[in-house]
């Protein structure tokens, strides 16, 4: 194209600039080290430093290791990125018992209240349940099967201690476990037909929360009530619903009683790292330029292998669209691309301040 | 050196209320959490509950024989830890020690590596 | 909760030998490679003492005749060889839940 000489040539007298015939316009040079954060540079602030990958960069320049969220109670909240940490959060009917930079010391899960003890604050990511005597007279709401028979008057104390300090919570302390019969009694309950004889008039047994009022004779509506954004999941728990407020989310569902938000990537992206409910990562949709296509697996598998996609064929995308968009991302199955979980490394157990790197070194960590 | 001391113990009605202090020394006590352990006389140690740090919002768990009749607080500014105690039974008779436990492991691994030589409560009518 | 069963109650070891301990919990108190099991020493008229976390890992300051092993549900600490200020009550603790609970104690005696 002889009408770009001009736009060229005016890039060639100056050593720090390049001519990016893709986008037909002059270009800045970043210097030895520095990476573009675009296609097609402008000033020097459009350099950065390239970290290695599952490195990220600090607000002090220095390639810090993200990190990981390899023991069993964590969950990948948010990934790795150019200048911000993964961050870990505890996996769902757990809370974080002890916060780290980025992640969580240590999980917990949910206590469920014992006898003579009711729901006051259902437990959240951050916090285990609180818990708070059950008052004398009320339509007993089994927190425990021994809340279901009439309380001796020696297990309930008629008055609320006064706690010192403000601050402090009864958090009850009997873990609730997904496997437990009450869990499945209260699940069975939630999918019953509210006409069925079983659920009518029955005070909930579900451990963890109770109603809000005793069950009004005949009615079926005696479920959990959760605070807003939580749901109640399969095992009776209240459970945060996802959050879809990274930008590159959009709400696909809302978070119902008994059903998570969901989160899909925004139009003109696809999940390139698929998670519960949402997606940890997005990525831009590629136009007709992807050779391989995902093999679709049971979800609850951790690695999603790629094969070569049939002879002719192409992963959905436009090759000149028309309006600019591109459809969005809506089974983690379309993925293009999944990262595999962090290799586990070996535990370093010490009484030391120390995390692992996503490499394996140990790094000081400041708890 | 680190220290803790506990105090308040002594003998009380069943149905009274009693509050123990921890006073410690030698270590940065706002960055730790603090423990409530008993021993009944003869027998075992029996885990009370624990308060965490600043941290971590200064928030308490409890075992299911005291929740609900006892709660954990502390003055960081004096490096003192509290136990409210109240209903008290026969039962809670006991040595009450305050523990520390350093939240510094990835994981933390709560273990309680300092305590107070206890003070003893009775209660008794 | 999860219950720990020390065991023996209570043994008798001559000076030298080998002293052997074991703590069973109820349910698996390990994650992630971590085995959230603590012992402790508690001498007569004297507040405990913690002598290993995480199953295996000595607090600073303890001998090294003290070491630690296990994983999951069964877990042991030997002290060998057995000294006479050994005498005491060892008890293990677990962290792996809410609540925390310590084992009955085993009372060690020097023969």
């Known amino acids: 194209f002889p009408q770009d000489r001009p736009f060229e040539d005016t890039c060639h007298g100056n050593p720090s600039h390049y001519y990016d015939k893709a986008v037909r316009r002059c270009c800045y040079r970043c210097p030895m080290g520095l990476f573009p954060t675009q296609q097609c540079p402008q000033r020097p602030t459009d350099c950065r430093k390239q970290c290695e990958p599952d490195y990220y960069l600090d607000e002090a320049d220095r390639c810090t290791a993200c990190v990981t969220c390899s023991r069993d109670d964590l969950v990948e909240k948010t990934p790795c990125a150019w200048n911000s940490s993964r961050v870990c959060e505890c996996r769902p009917g757990m809370f974080c018992s002890t916060s780290a930079v980025n992640s969580c010391a240590r999980c917990f899960f949910h206590s469920v209240c014992p006898a003579g003890m009711i729901v006051k604050f259902p437990g959240t990511a951050q916090k285990n349940t609180v818990c708070e005597p059950a008052s004398p007279g009320v339509s007993p709401a089994c927190a425990s099967p021994e809340n279901c028979k009439e309380p001796s008057s020696g297990t309930i104390p008629q008055a609320k201690p006064t706690p010192v300090s403000p601050a402090t919570s009864s958090a009850s302390t009997m873990p609730v476990r997904g496997g437990t019969r009450l869990a499945q009694e209260a699940a069975s309950k939630l999918t019953r037909a509210p006409d069925s004889p079983s659920s009518v008039g029955r005070p909930s047994s579900d451990p963890g929360l109770s109603p809000t009022q005793p069950c009004p004779e005949g009615s079926g509506d005696c479920r959990k009530q959760c605070e807003p954004d939580y749901y109640l999941d399969e095992a009776g728990r209240c459970t945060a619903c996802v959050s879809c407020s990274r930008d590159d989310l959009v709400e696909k569902t809302p978070c119902a009683w008994n059903s998570s938000r969901t989160c899909e990537c925004r139009p003109g992206m696809i999940c390139a790292t698929s998670a519960t409910n949402s997606c940890a990562r997005c990525v831009p949709y590629p136009i007709c330029a992807a050779e391989t296509v995902t093999k679709p697996q049971d979800m609850a598998e951790k690695d999603t292998t790629f094969e070569a996609p049939p002879l002719g064929t192409q992963p959905d995308c436009n090759p000149t669209p028309e309006n600019g968009e591109a459809p969005a991302s809506t089974s983690p199955t379309q993925s293009l691309l999944v990262d595999s979980q962090a290799s586990k490394t070996l535990p370093i157990p010490t009484s030391a301040p120390v995390a692992l790197s996503s490499t394996g070194k140990p790094v000081l960590d400041a708890g | 050196e680190v220290k803790l001391v506990e105090s308040g113990g002594g003998l009380v009605q069943p149905g009274g209320s009693l509050r123990l202090s921890c006073a410690t020394s030698?270590?940065?006590?706002?960055?730790?959490?603090m423990n409530w352990v008993r021993q009944p006389p003869g027998k075992a140690l029996e885990w009370l509950g624990f308060?965490?740090?600043?941290?971590?919002?200064?928030?308490?768990e409890f075992s299911a024989s005291v929740m609900g009749r006892f709660t954990i607080s502390r003055d960081d500014s004096q490096s003192i830890l509290y136990l409210q105690m109240n209903t008290l039974r026969a039962e809670d008779s006991a040595t009450y020690y305050c523990?520390?436990?350093?939240?510094?492991?990835?994981?933390?691994?709560?273990?309680?590596?300092?305590w107070g030589q206890g003070t003893s409560v009775t209660v008794s009518s | 909760d999860i219950v720990l069963t020390q065991s023996p109650a209570s043994l008798a070891v001559s000076l030298g030998q080998r002293a052997t301990i074991s703590c069973r919990a109820s349910?698996?108190?390990?994650?992630?490679?971590?085995?959230?099991m603590h012992w402790y020493q508690q001498k007569a008229g004297q507040p405990p003492k913690l002598l290993i976390h995480?199953?295996?890992n000595l607090e600073s300051g303890v001998p090294a005749r003290f070491s630690g092993s296990g994983s999951g549900t069964d877990f042991t600490l030997n002290i060998h060889p057995v000294e006479e200020e050994d005498a005491s009550t060892y008890y293990c603790?677990?962290?792996?839940?809410?609540?925390?609970?310590f084992g009955s104690g085993t009372k060690l005696e020097i023969k």
């Open positions: 995480l199953a295996s």
């Open positions: 603790q677990h962290s792996g839940e809410l609540p925390f609970t």
């Open positions: 030698g270590f940065t006590f706002s960055d730790y959490y």
């Open positions: 308060i965490r740090n600043k941290a971590n919002g200064y928030t308490t």
């Open positions: 349910k698996s108190v390990s994650a992630s490679g971590y085995n959230y």
């Open positions: 523990a520390r436990d350093p939240p510094y492991g990835n994981p933390h691994y709560y273990a309680m590596d300092y």
